[in-house]
């Protein structure tokens, strides 16, 4: 079989700050010099892209400077991280990589993780 | 809404070219690889081409491969099929389509028919 | 390149029937890129189905899909005069994406 796994974390919580951060590794059935990394949002049957970056194997991922994203690329694993969460974002987010270069083209979906993201609760007034 | 349309079609002679056009709007498109797909007539589904993201990365069928040109603008929201060397086999209702972020095929224009005929 | 072969090629059915369409791989493909379309004449083909048995936008409950590795299948329920017309499987993981033969779903 010729199809691309792609292993993500079922579950995730997000820091107080709102901050997520995963492993998303990919089983590669070619050898790819070009690789673009989505991550997407499932919420309900609706499917919205969260970020993109393409990298060339051995440098570094970049993301848009305005990505909530950032990231770094180690041989078949990316370490994601996304951030300015809110409890209003808890949802599945799921990995797709797609090996774009030499031919033929690859499409990988992992199964998402569940991310929680709770807001902090605001600081009490204190009284001294 | 989400849209694709295509133009472009005609009768065209063995050898020749043209260039047929998908205007996409409803969507942000430079986030979307596109595809060309036809359909000769009383034939199935034939895939063709598709070009992903800003364009630098292109795939063909054997059946087009150094007859056929993919590309795209995205600054106009439009994606191309440049057919040079045109045969009778070519004939077919040429469809662009989609590629979700899921990957299926999940918008498609109406179509334009391209028929070369001497 | 992966082949696809679809069974039967026409099916002669009644509204109300079950109808059950066959997609079968020359090698495995992922469930997670297997797709179903509906192509009615002179009518662009719709997505139906995608990643084997997940529904897209706006697709009744009565067709659902199944299946994994080279085996898949799609059945709608009980058949509406509308559910009449040519379906394609499809697979998307890799390059060159290739279709199915289709099967026409006509009235008996």
């Known amino acids: 079989c010729k199809a691309m796994h792609v292993a993500q974390p079922a579950v995730v919580l997000a820091s107080s700050r709102g901050i997520a951060s995963f492993v998303c590794e990919y089983a590669s059935p070619g050898k790819a010099t070009e690789v673009r990394v989505t991550v997407l949002r499932q919420a309900d049957s609706q499917v919205t892209e969260v970020c993109a970056a393409t990298y060339m194997m051995g440098n570094e991922l970049t993301f848009l400077d305005d990505s909530i994203c950032t990231g770094t690329s180690s041989g078949n694993q990316v370490n994601l991280t996304i951030q300015g969460l809110r409890a209003m974002d808890t949802g599945l987010y799921i990995c797709k990589v797609e090996l774009m270069y030499p031919p033929p083209y690859y499409l990988g979906i992992g199964n998402g993780t569940q991310i929680y993201v709770i807001d902090p609760e605001p600081c009490p007034d204190s009284d001294f | 809404q989400v849209q694709l349309v295509e133009s472009g079609g005609g009768v065209v002679q063995p050898g020749r070219s043209l260039r047929l056009s998908c205007a996409a709007s409803?969507?942000?498109?430079?986030?979307?690889?596109m595809h060309w797909v036809r359909q000769a007539p009383g034939k199935g589904l034939e895939w063709v081409a598709v070009?992903?993201?800003?364009?630098?990365?292109?795939h063909y069928a054997d059946s087009v491969k150094g007859r056929f040109t993919i590309s795209r603008d995205n600054s106009k929201n439009t994606l191309y099929l440049q057919m040079n060397s045109l045969r009778a086999e070519d004939t077919a209702v040429y469809y662009c389509?989609?590629?979700?972020?899921?990957?299926?095929?999940?918008?498609w224009g109406q179509g334009t028919m391209v028929t070369v005929s001497s | 390149e992966i082949v696809l072969t679809q069974s039967p090629g026409t099916l002669s059915l009644s509204p109300g029937e079950r109808a059950t369409l066959s997609c079968r791989a020359s090698?495995?493909?992922?469930?997670?890129?297997l797709a179903w379309y509906q192509q009615k004449p002179g009518q662009a083909p719709r997505l139906l189905i995608y990643?084997?048995?997940s529904r897209a936008t706006g697709i009744p409950d009565r067709f659902s899909g199944s299946g994994s590795g080279t085996d898949f299948t799609l059945t709608i329920s009980r058949l509406e005069p509308e559910d009449f017309a040519v379906y394609y499987c499809?697979?998307?993981?890799?390059?060159?994406?290739?279709f199915g033969p289709g099967t026409k779903v006509d009235i008996k």
């Open positions: 389509a989609r590629n979700g972020l899921i990957g299926a095929f999940d918008i």
């Open positions: 409803g969507f942000t498109f430079r986030s979307y690889g």
């Open positions: 070009i992903w993201y800003d364009g630098s990365n292109k």
């Open positions: 090698q495995s493909v992922s469930s997670s890129y």
């Open positions: 990643g084997a048995s």
């Open positions: 499809q697979q998307y993981g890799s390059s060159p994406f290739t």
